[in-house]
Protein backbone atom coordinates (compact mmCIF):
# COMPACT_ATOMS: atom_id res chain seq x y z
CA UNK A 1 0.00 0.00 0.00
CA UNK A 2 1.53 3.14 -0.49
CA UNK A 3 0.91 5.53 2.07
CA UNK A 4 -1.87 8.74 1.70
CA UNK A 5 -0.62 11.82 3.53
CA UNK A 6 -3.17 14.16 4.78
CA UNK A 7 -2.31 17.93 6.49
CA UNK A 8 -4.09 19.35 9.05
CA UNK A 9 -3.43 22.56 11.18
CA UNK A 10 -3.36 22.58 14.63
CA UNK A 11 -6.70 23.47 16.46
CA UNK A 12 -8.45 22.49 13.93
CA UNK A 13 -10.33 19.87 12.42
CA UNK A 14 -9.09 17.21 9.77
CA UNK A 15 -11.14 14.97 7.53
CA UNK A 16 -9.63 11.75 6.05
CA UNK A 17 -11.31 9.92 3.37
CA UNK A 18 -10.15 6.82 2.33
CA UNK A 19 -12.51 5.23 -0.97
CA UNK A 20 -12.23 1.36 -1.20
CA UNK A 21 -14.83 -0.84 -3.71
CA UNK A 22 -18.32 -0.71 -2.09
CA UNK A 23 -19.19 -4.64 -3.94
CA UNK A 24 -16.14 -6.09 -2.33
CA UNK A 25 -16.33 -4.72 1.14
CA UNK A 26 -19.81 -5.37 1.06
CA UNK A 27 -21.19 -6.29 4.61
CA UNK A 28 -17.73 -5.48 6.40
CA UNK A 29 -17.64 -2.80 9.16
CA UNK A 30 -14.57 -0.09 9.15
CA UNK A 31 -12.21 0.79 11.44
CA UNK A 32 -9.30 3.44 11.96
CA UNK A 33 -6.58 2.55 13.32
CA UNK A 34 -3.47 4.45 14.72
CA UNK A 35 -0.08 2.22 14.12
CA UNK A 36 2.88 2.23 16.42
CA UNK A 37 5.67 2.92 14.26
CA UNK A 38 5.94 1.55 10.52
CA UNK A 39 6.05 -2.12 10.96
CA UNK A 40 4.24 -1.80 14.68
CA UNK A 41 0.70 -2.87 15.27
CA UNK A 42 -2.62 -0.83 14.42
CA UNK A 43 -4.27 0.12 17.77
CA UNK A 44 -8.09 0.09 17.31
CA UNK A 45 -9.25 4.26 17.73
CA UNK A 46 -12.43 3.76 16.59
CA UNK A 47 -14.78 1.73 14.56
CA UNK A 48 -18.28 2.04 12.33
CA UNK A 49 -21.60 1.23 13.61
CA UNK A 50 -21.90 -2.66 14.83
CA UNK A 51 -25.19 -3.06 12.54
CA UNK A 52 -23.56 -2.55 8.79
CA UNK A 53 -27.15 -0.98 7.94
CA UNK A 54 -26.57 1.80 10.03
CA UNK A 55 -22.49 2.35 9.20
CA UNK A 56 -23.70 5.75 7.48
CA UNK A 57 -24.15 6.92 11.58
CA UNK A 58 -21.09 8.65 13.14
CA UNK A 59 -19.51 7.29 16.27
CA UNK A 60 -17.34 8.82 18.56
CA UNK A 61 -14.08 8.18 19.90
CA UNK A 62 -13.07 11.54 21.83
CA UNK A 63 -11.66 13.90 18.97
CA UNK A 64 -11.95 11.07 16.27
CA UNK A 65 -15.50 10.24 14.65
CA UNK A 66 -16.11 7.52 11.62
CA UNK A 67 -18.98 7.41 9.06
CA UNK A 68 -18.93 5.22 6.29
CA UNK A 69 -20.72 6.06 3.00
CA UNK A 70 -21.38 2.24 2.18
CA UNK A 71 -22.79 2.59 -1.07
CA UNK A 72 -20.69 5.70 -2.11
CA UNK A 73 -17.46 3.30 -0.89
CA UNK A 74 -16.05 5.75 1.39
CA UNK A 75 -14.86 5.96 4.58
CA UNK A 76 -14.49 9.26 6.30
CA UNK A 77 -12.66 9.75 9.60
CA UNK A 78 -12.83 13.58 11.12
CA UNK A 79 -10.27 14.32 13.69
CA UNK A 80 -11.65 17.92 16.01
CA UNK A 81 -9.49 19.93 17.49
CA UNK A 82 -6.03 18.41 15.60
CA UNK A 83 -3.15 18.43 18.02
CA UNK A 84 0.46 17.33 17.86
CA UNK A 85 0.62 14.31 19.40
CA UNK A 86 -2.51 13.28 16.71
CA UNK A 87 0.13 13.18 14.10
CA UNK A 88 0.99 10.11 13.04
CA UNK A 89 0.88 6.68 10.81
CA UNK A 90 -2.84 5.02 10.66
CA UNK A 91 -4.81 2.81 8.96
CA UNK A 92 -8.32 2.62 7.58
CA UNK A 93 -9.77 -1.32 7.46
CA UNK A 94 -12.50 -3.32 6.47
CA UNK A 95 -12.83 -5.69 9.26
CA UNK A 96 -14.46 -9.60 8.41
CA UNK A 97 -14.27 -12.19 11.17
CA UNK A 98 -11.08 -11.58 13.05
CA UNK A 99 -9.41 -10.31 10.50
CA UNK A 100 -8.73 -6.59 8.80
CA UNK A 101 -7.61 -5.73 5.62
CA UNK A 102 -6.13 -2.09 5.01
CA UNK A 103 -8.09 -0.11 2.82
CA UNK A 104 -5.31 2.64 2.61
CA UNK A 105 -2.47 3.73 4.83
CA UNK A 106 -2.19 7.45 6.20
CA UNK A 107 0.14 9.62 7.45
CA UNK A 108 -1.04 12.80 9.51
CA UNK A 109 0.64 15.70 9.54
CA UNK A 110 -0.39 18.11 12.19
CA UNK A 111 0.90 22.00 10.75
CA UNK A 112 1.50 25.06 12.88
CA UNK A 113 -1.48 27.57 13.20
CA UNK A 114 -0.27 30.32 10.78
CA UNK A 115 -2.65 32.72 12.84
CA UNK A 116 -0.89 31.90 16.19
CA UNK A 117 1.89 34.45 16.45
CA UNK A 118 3.13 32.82 19.89
CA UNK A 119 6.43 32.64 18.50
CA UNK A 120 6.49 32.72 14.25
CA UNK A 121 10.14 32.26 14.10
CA UNK A 122 8.80 28.61 14.76
CA UNK A 123 6.47 28.02 12.15
CA UNK A 124 7.13 25.14 10.20
CA UNK A 125 6.90 25.32 6.35
CA UNK A 126 7.32 21.95 5.12
CA UNK A 127 11.02 21.27 3.85
CA UNK A 128 11.76 19.43 0.94
CA UNK A 129 14.53 17.98 2.48
CA UNK A 130 13.51 13.74 1.58
CA UNK A 131 10.43 12.92 0.25
CA UNK A 132 8.13 10.32 1.99
CA UNK A 133 8.20 7.67 -0.78
CA UNK A 134 5.42 6.61 -2.56
CA UNK A 135 2.89 9.02 -0.65
CA UNK A 136 0.50 11.36 -1.66
CA UNK A 137 -0.39 14.44 -0.12
CA UNK A 138 -3.94 15.98 0.60
CA UNK A 139 -4.31 18.88 2.88
CA UNK A 140 -7.24 19.68 5.03
CA UNK A 141 -8.06 22.32 2.51
CA UNK A 142 -8.99 19.36 0.06
CA UNK A 143 -6.24 20.57 -2.22
CA UNK A 144 -4.12 17.41 -3.60
CA UNK A 145 -0.99 17.76 -4.55
CA UNK A 146 0.79 15.10 -7.56
CA UNK A 147 2.51 12.18 -6.65
CA UNK A 148 5.56 12.82 -5.83
CA UNK A 149 5.07 16.45 -5.05
CA UNK A 150 5.61 15.71 -1.45
CA UNK A 151 6.62 18.64 0.44
CA UNK A 152 7.97 17.52 3.54
CA UNK A 153 10.02 14.96 5.43
CA UNK A 154 9.31 11.59 6.63
CA UNK A 155 8.86 11.61 10.53
CA UNK A 156 9.70 9.07 13.27
CA UNK B 1 14.37 -13.99 25.70
CA UNK B 2 14.24 -11.04 23.06
CA UNK B 3 17.92 -9.81 22.31
CA UNK B 4 20.44 -8.41 20.11
CA UNK B 5 24.02 -10.13 20.34
CA UNK B 6 26.80 -8.58 18.47
CA UNK B 7 29.94 -9.99 17.62
CA UNK B 8 33.20 -9.35 19.86
CA UNK B 9 36.05 -6.44 19.76
CA UNK B 10 37.79 -5.25 16.54
CA UNK B 11 41.13 -4.11 15.85
CA UNK B 12 42.16 -2.85 12.71
CA UNK B 13 44.81 -0.97 11.11
CA UNK B 14 43.95 2.53 8.97
CA UNK B 15 42.70 1.78 5.90
CA UNK B 16 41.36 -1.37 6.75
CA UNK B 17 37.78 -2.80 6.60
CA UNK B 18 35.81 -4.13 9.81
CA UNK B 19 32.20 -5.76 9.43
CA UNK B 20 30.11 -6.18 12.74
CA UNK B 21 27.35 -8.70 13.30
CA UNK B 22 23.77 -8.52 15.25
CA UNK B 23 22.04 -11.29 15.67
CA UNK B 24 18.49 -11.30 16.43
CA UNK B 25 17.08 -13.74 18.80
CA UNK B 26 13.36 -14.10 20.23
CA UNK B 27 11.51 -11.76 17.15
CA UNK B 28 11.85 -11.71 13.39
CA UNK B 29 13.83 -9.24 12.14
CA UNK B 30 11.86 -8.74 9.58
CA UNK B 31 9.53 -6.96 11.57
CA UNK B 32 11.68 -4.26 12.60
CA UNK B 33 14.33 -1.51 11.26
CA UNK B 34 17.84 -2.31 12.47
CA UNK B 35 20.21 1.13 12.80
CA UNK B 36 23.87 1.70 13.37
CA UNK B 37 24.64 4.38 15.95
CA UNK B 38 28.58 4.24 17.35
CA UNK B 39 30.16 6.01 19.65
CA UNK B 40 33.63 7.50 19.94
CA UNK B 41 35.40 7.04 23.17
CA UNK B 42 34.20 9.72 26.31
CA UNK B 43 31.66 11.36 23.05
CA UNK B 44 27.87 10.89 21.87
CA UNK B 45 25.65 8.93 19.71
CA UNK B 46 26.40 9.23 16.31
CA UNK B 47 23.38 7.16 13.99
CA UNK B 48 24.93 5.56 11.22
CA UNK B 49 22.31 4.22 9.05
CA UNK B 50 19.54 1.49 9.26
CA UNK B 51 18.17 -1.56 6.81
CA UNK B 52 14.93 -2.59 6.40
CA UNK B 53 15.36 -6.42 6.39
CA UNK B 54 12.26 -7.26 4.98
CA UNK B 55 13.24 -6.10 1.21
CA UNK B 56 16.83 -4.95 1.99
CA UNK B 57 16.29 -1.25 1.43
CA UNK B 58 19.18 0.57 3.57
CA UNK B 59 19.79 4.66 4.07
CA UNK B 60 22.79 5.86 5.71
CA UNK B 61 23.82 9.09 7.01
CA UNK B 62 25.25 11.35 4.25
CA UNK B 63 28.72 11.72 6.81
CA UNK B 64 28.96 7.67 6.15
CA UNK B 65 27.69 7.06 2.53
CA UNK B 66 30.23 5.25 0.33
CA UNK B 67 31.95 3.98 3.29
CA UNK B 68 29.33 1.99 5.07
CA UNK B 69 27.55 -1.10 4.05
CA UNK B 70 24.50 -2.43 6.17
CA UNK B 71 23.21 -5.53 4.90
CA UNK B 72 20.89 -8.25 6.67
CA UNK B 73 20.43 -12.36 6.21
CA UNK B 74 17.13 -12.81 7.08
CA UNK B 75 17.56 -16.50 7.33
CA UNK B 76 19.76 -16.18 9.92
CA UNK B 77 18.08 -13.31 11.61
CA UNK B 78 21.63 -11.51 11.54
CA UNK B 79 21.92 -7.70 10.42
CA UNK B 80 26.18 -6.45 9.66
CA UNK B 81 27.90 -3.36 9.35
CA UNK B 82 30.72 -2.94 7.24
CA UNK B 83 32.90 0.12 7.18
CA UNK B 84 35.92 0.41 4.73
CA UNK B 85 38.71 2.71 4.96
CA UNK B 86 39.20 2.85 8.66
CA UNK B 87 40.93 5.68 9.85
CA UNK B 88 41.56 6.13 14.12
CA UNK B 89 38.48 8.53 14.57
CA UNK B 90 36.53 5.48 13.44
CA UNK B 91 37.37 4.17 16.78
CA UNK B 92 34.02 3.76 18.38
CA UNK B 93 31.62 1.28 20.38
CA UNK B 94 29.39 0.36 17.50
CA UNK B 95 25.64 -0.25 18.38
CA UNK B 96 23.18 -2.19 16.75
CA UNK B 97 19.19 -1.00 17.36
CA UNK B 98 16.08 -2.64 16.27
CA UNK B 99 12.56 -0.50 16.01
CA UNK B 100 9.02 -0.41 14.31
CA UNK B 101 10.36 2.96 12.00
CA UNK B 102 8.95 5.99 12.42
CA UNK B 103 5.67 7.02 13.68
CA UNK B 104 6.04 6.42 16.98
CA UNK B 105 7.27 2.88 17.44
CA UNK B 106 7.02 1.47 20.56
CA UNK B 107 9.61 -1.30 20.53
CA UNK B 108 12.98 -0.44 20.80
CA UNK B 109 16.06 -3.10 21.33
CA UNK B 110 19.75 -2.36 21.35
CA UNK B 111 22.86 -4.86 21.08
CA UNK B 112 25.54 -4.77 23.83
CA UNK B 113 28.07 -2.87 21.58
CA UNK B 114 31.15 -3.67 19.83
CA UNK B 115 34.32 -1.69 20.33
CA UNK B 116 36.15 -1.26 17.16
CA UNK B 117 39.68 0.15 17.40
CA UNK B 118 41.69 1.49 15.07
CA UNK B 119 45.22 2.11 15.18
CA UNK B 120 48.59 1.25 13.24
CA UNK C 1 20.70 17.81 8.62
CA UNK C 2 18.19 18.50 11.53
CA UNK C 3 20.62 19.86 14.47
CA UNK C 4 19.28 19.03 17.91
CA UNK C 5 20.72 20.99 20.66
CA UNK C 6 20.79 20.09 24.28
CA UNK C 7 21.30 22.02 27.50
CA UNK C 8 22.66 22.27 29.78
CA UNK C 9 25.51 19.60 28.69
CA UNK C 10 26.03 18.51 32.50
CA UNK C 11 24.51 19.04 35.57
CA UNK C 12 24.83 18.29 39.34
CA UNK C 13 21.95 17.15 41.58
CA UNK C 14 21.03 15.74 44.87
CA UNK C 15 18.54 12.75 45.26
CA UNK C 16 15.17 14.23 45.27
CA UNK C 17 15.92 16.56 43.30
CA UNK C 18 13.51 17.93 40.16
CA UNK C 19 16.18 17.80 37.02
CA UNK C 20 15.00 19.49 33.64
CA UNK C 21 16.81 19.35 30.57
CA UNK C 22 16.04 20.91 27.28
CA UNK C 23 16.18 19.75 23.85
CA UNK C 24 16.06 22.34 20.98
CA UNK C 25 15.51 20.91 17.16
CA UNK C 26 17.02 23.54 14.51
CA UNK C 27 14.08 22.51 12.36
CA UNK C 28 10.31 21.57 13.26
CA UNK C 29 10.11 17.79 14.28
CA UNK C 30 6.73 17.99 15.42
CA UNK C 31 6.47 15.44 18.20
CA UNK C 32 9.24 13.22 16.59
CA UNK C 33 11.51 13.12 19.48
CA UNK C 34 12.79 10.39 21.81
CA UNK C 35 14.75 10.55 24.79
CA UNK C 36 17.19 8.05 26.01
CA UNK C 37 19.19 7.38 28.95
CA UNK C 38 22.74 6.12 28.73
CA UNK C 39 25.12 4.40 31.61
CA UNK C 40 28.57 4.05 31.75
CA UNK C 41 29.48 1.09 29.12
CA UNK C 42 26.11 0.34 28.48
CA UNK C 43 23.73 0.66 25.11
CA UNK C 44 20.86 3.49 25.55
CA UNK C 45 17.70 2.82 26.97
CA UNK C 46 14.73 4.46 25.57
CA UNK C 47 12.74 6.59 28.10
CA UNK C 48 10.45 8.42 25.70
CA UNK C 49 9.07 8.38 22.66
CA UNK C 50 6.52 10.82 20.31
CA UNK C 51 7.92 13.24 22.92
CA UNK C 52 5.53 12.75 25.59
CA UNK C 53 5.08 8.94 25.56
CA UNK C 54 6.96 6.84 28.17
CA UNK C 55 8.34 3.61 27.09
CA UNK C 56 7.28 0.89 28.88
CA UNK C 57 9.19 -0.44 32.16
CA UNK C 58 10.00 3.10 32.53
CA UNK C 59 9.25 5.13 36.00
CA UNK C 60 6.83 7.54 36.26
CA UNK C 61 9.41 9.81 37.60
CA UNK C 62 10.32 10.21 34.03
CA UNK C 63 7.79 13.02 32.01
CA UNK C 64 8.43 14.41 28.63
CA UNK C 65 6.87 17.16 26.56
CA UNK C 66 6.74 19.66 23.51
CA UNK C 67 6.45 19.82 20.18
CA UNK C 68 7.66 21.78 17.29
CA UNK C 69 11.15 23.01 18.09
CA UNK C 70 11.29 22.74 22.08
CA UNK C 71 10.94 19.82 24.22
CA UNK C 72 11.87 18.95 27.88
CA UNK C 73 12.76 16.20 29.65
CA UNK C 74 12.36 16.38 33.41
CA UNK C 75 12.59 13.88 35.98
CA UNK C 76 10.29 14.86 39.15
CA UNK C 77 12.56 13.22 42.13
CA UNK C 78 15.75 12.21 40.94
CA UNK C 79 17.07 8.46 42.38
CA UNK C 80 20.27 7.40 42.41
CA UNK C 81 19.85 4.95 39.60
CA UNK C 82 18.88 8.43 37.26
CA UNK C 83 22.64 9.45 37.61
CA UNK C 84 23.86 8.76 33.70
CA UNK C 85 23.79 10.96 30.34
CA UNK C 86 20.32 12.05 28.49
CA UNK C 87 20.66 12.40 24.86
CA UNK C 88 17.32 13.62 22.80
CA UNK C 89 17.05 12.16 19.33
CA UNK C 90 15.02 13.14 16.03
CA UNK C 91 13.17 11.16 14.18
CA UNK C 92 11.28 14.04 11.41
CA UNK C 93 13.55 13.01 8.89
CA UNK C 94 16.70 10.76 7.91
CA UNK C 95 19.14 11.00 9.12
CA UNK C 96 18.06 10.61 12.76
CA UNK C 97 20.41 12.87 14.43
CA UNK C 98 21.27 13.33 18.49
CA UNK C 99 21.69 15.67 20.91
CA UNK C 100 24.83 15.94 22.44
CA UNK C 101 24.02 14.79 25.74
CA UNK C 102 23.02 15.94 28.91
CA UNK C 103 25.34 14.12 32.25
CA UNK C 104 23.59 14.21 35.39
CA UNK C 105 26.06 13.80 38.26
CA UNK C 106 25.51 13.86 41.85
CA UNK C 107 26.02 16.60 44.17
Known amino acids: HNTTVFQGVEGQSLQVSCPYDSMKHWGRRKAWCRQLGEKGPCQRVVSTHNLWLLSFLRRRNGSTAITDDTLGGTLTITLRNLQPHDAGFYQCQSLHGSEADTLRKVLVEVLADPLDHRDAGDLWVPGESESFEDAHVEHSISRSLLEGEIPFPPTS | QVQLVQSGAEVKKPGASVKVSCKAS????????IHWVRQAPGQGLEWMGW????????KYAPKFQGRVTITADTSTSTAYMELSSLRSEDTAVYYCHADHGNYGSTMDYWGQGTLVTVSS | DIQMTQSPSSLSASVGDRVTITCHAS??????LSWYQQKPGKAPKLLIYKASNLHTGVPSRFSGSGSGTDFTLTISSLQPEDFATYYC?????????FGQGTKVEIK
Open chain 2, 26 to 33: GFSIEDFY
Open chain 3, 27 to 32: QHINVW
Open chain 3, 89 to 97: QQGQTYPRT
Open chain 2, 51 to 58: IDPENGES
